[in-house]
């Protein structure tokens, strides 16, 4: 069932079918005998009760006041009254733009990130049974889509998808043809969720070690889900049996990004492990960033300024 019209202020375009549905509909069915009345007031006119004799364009069904179609002079306040229940709406009917397939003031704006899922479905549940066909237009040019009952676009957004999409439903009522237009202004923007990944700590790290002992080099980064973090060392990774890349640890930050940490474990440090670069790289769609670690014998510490050491 179509949900009730809960918005107190409504703007509609002249010449289109329109309806108001009150929000105590289920209750009204229970109290069939209760008197239910619709009223309109505009300007100097106080509450005027509405009925099909008021206008050939107005129809009343159970919970609904229908306009076939709504016109400029329908602007005003509308009331539904039943026992001690009252609901009020303020209706503003605006002029149709004769030079376009849609009226700018009746456009719903949506922002879609590039490459994210983008969907437009043309459906109108209230008038569904009366709709003969539906067309979807982009910037007022008809799109040729397979389904002419409920035309749909489902895709990953591209910048070229930006524009005004108008769903136009064509329907018959009492031998007359009407149309209802719903327009979306789709703006495609850059992926706002991605950050530039950041390797934490200094870019060059000298680590004081003792021969025969073990060392753990920790590489940490703030990154996106798709970004990768890895160690590069020697001619070909894996040639040194004493070097082990530990499993990456990831923790999600409150902002939805990731704090990643990857440890390189070097066991039984030998001369061949000294004074060579162990590079940790983070790679993203934006590029790469690298920080380097150099193992230095503790005895040689005096040759290097203290501030470049890490533990």
């Amino acid at each position: 069932a179509e949900s009730c019209t809960s918005r107190p202020h409504i703007t509609v375009v002249e010449g289109e079918p329109f309806y108001l549905k009150h929000c105590s509909c289920s209750l009204a069915h229970e109290i069939e005998t209760t008197t239910k009345s619709w009223y309109k007031s505009s300007g100097s006119q106080e509450h005027v009760e509405l009925n099909p004799r008021s206008s050939s364009r107005i129809a009343l069904h159970d919970c609904v006041l229908e306009f076939w179609p709504v016109e400029l002079n329908d602007t005003g306040s509308y009331f539904f009254q039943m026992k001690n229940y009252t609901q009020k709406w303020k209706l503003n009917v605006i002029r149709r733009n004769k030079h376009s397939c849609f009226t700018e003031r009746q456009v719903t704006s949506k922002i879609v990130e590039v490459k994210k899922f983008f969907q437009i479905t043309c459906e109108n549940s209230y008038y569904q049974t009366l709709v003969n066909s539906t067309s979807l237009y982009k910037n007022c040019k008809k799109l040729l889509l397979e389904n002419n009952k409920n035309p749909t676009i489902k895709k990953n957004a591209e910048f070229e998808d930006q524009g005004y999409y108008s769903c136009v439903h064509f329907l018959h009522h009492n031998g007359k043809l009407f149309n209802i237009t719903k327009t979306f202004n789709i703006t495609i923007v850059e992926d706002r969720s991605n950050i530039v990944p950041v390797l934490l700590g200094p870019k060059l790290n000298h680590v004081a070690v003792e021969l025969g002992k073990n060392v753990r080099l920790n590489c940490s980064a703030l990154l996106n889900e798709e970004d990768v973090i890895y160690w590069m060392f020697g001619e070909e990774n894996g040639s040194d049996p004493n070097i082990h890349e530990e499993k990456e640890m990831r923790i999600m930050t409150p902002e939805g990004k990731w704090h990643a940490s990857k440890v390189l474990r070097i066991e039984n440090i030998g001369e061949s492990n000294l004074n060579v670069l162990y590079n940790c790289t983070v790679a993203s769609t934006g590029g790469t960033d690298t920080k380097s670690f150099i193992l230095v014998r503790k005895a040689d510490m005096a040759d290097i300024p203290g501030h470049v050491f890490t533990r």
Partner: antibody, heavy 115, light 113 residues
Framework: QVQLVQSGAEVKKPGASVKVSCKAS????????ISWVRQAPGQGLEWMGW????????NYAQKLQGRVTMTTDTSTSTAYMELRSLRSDDTAVYYC????????WGRGTLVTVSS | DIVMTQSPDSLAVSLGERATINCKSS????????????LAWYQQKPGQPPKLLIY???TRESGVPDRFSGSGSGTDFTLTISSLQAEDVAVYYC?????????FGQGTKLEIK
């Protein structure tokens, strides 16, 4: 329109250098790295290297190390690839491409190395 | 360095029939931290730059017809064209973007039988 526009074809003598430009438009230049890919006549695609537009970090294919330099100018959203000490087997179409899966490509720049 | 190997080198398929191209990487391009495969597929027609078809091994680029699909994980991947059309005649490349140097397969030439 989102695009990468490359500079025109070049004819060079062996030993010379060539600098190809790639101008990005309608997207945030620093969001994506720029890769350079070349294709010799009738051959497959060869990745040459890439540059991070946000920090200028580069990563070059081993075989081109020392001969290639990639740079960017963020003020004009332009990437450059310079190849030095040209040889006849450097004759190829040189493409710039965006990101790490290449969703946007330039039209290509033909560089002919001939004496 | 990761080496990408495609098979077959060339392929002839009748219009409307299924075409399958395989790609094998010398080491896994599956990143265990996010369970993503860092593999893309491209189509290249004569005189044109390559066009991205598939990324993350199976995500179709927007605007690419749904007859193109990608599958596989780790080291073995497949590009499938479910019903070959005349405009699909081209060379197809796989590419890994898991580790630099990023590398392409040697290409598979697809023709109509």
């Amino acid at each position: 329109q989102v695009q990468l526009v490359q500079s025109g074809a070049e004819v060079k003598k062996p030993g010379a250098s060539v600098k190809v430009s790639c101008k990005a438009s309608d997207y945030t230049f620093t969001t994506y790295g720029i890769s350079w890919v070349r294709q010799a006549p009738g051959q497959g695609l060869e990745w040459m290297g890439w540059i991070s537009a946000y920090n200028g970090n580069t990563n070059y294919a081993q075989k081109l190390q020392g001969r290639v330099t990639m740079t960017t100018d963020t003020s004009t959203s332009t990437a450059y690839m310079e190849l030095r000490s040209l040889r006849s087997d450097d004759t190829a179409v040189y493409y710039c491409a965006r990101g790490w899966y290449f969703d946007l490509w330039g039209r290509g720049t033909l560089v002919t190395v001939s004496s | 360095d990761i080496v990408m190997t495609q098979s077959p080198d060339s392929l002839a398929v009748s219009l409307g029939e299924r075409a399958t191209i395989n790609c094998k990487s010398s080491q896994s391009v599956l990143y265990s931290s996010n369970n993503k495969n860092y593999l893309a597929w491209y189509q290249q027609k004569p005189g044109q730059p390559p066009k991205l078809l598939i990324y993350w091994a199976s995500t179709r680029e927007s605007g690419v017809p749904d007859r193109f699909s990608g599958s596989g994980s780790g080291t073995d991947f497949t590009l499938t064209i479910s019903s070959l059309q005349a405009e699909d005649v081209a060379v197809y490349y796989c590419q890994q973007y898991y580790r630099t140097p990023y590398s392409f397969g040697q290409g598979t030439k697809l023709e109509i039988k």
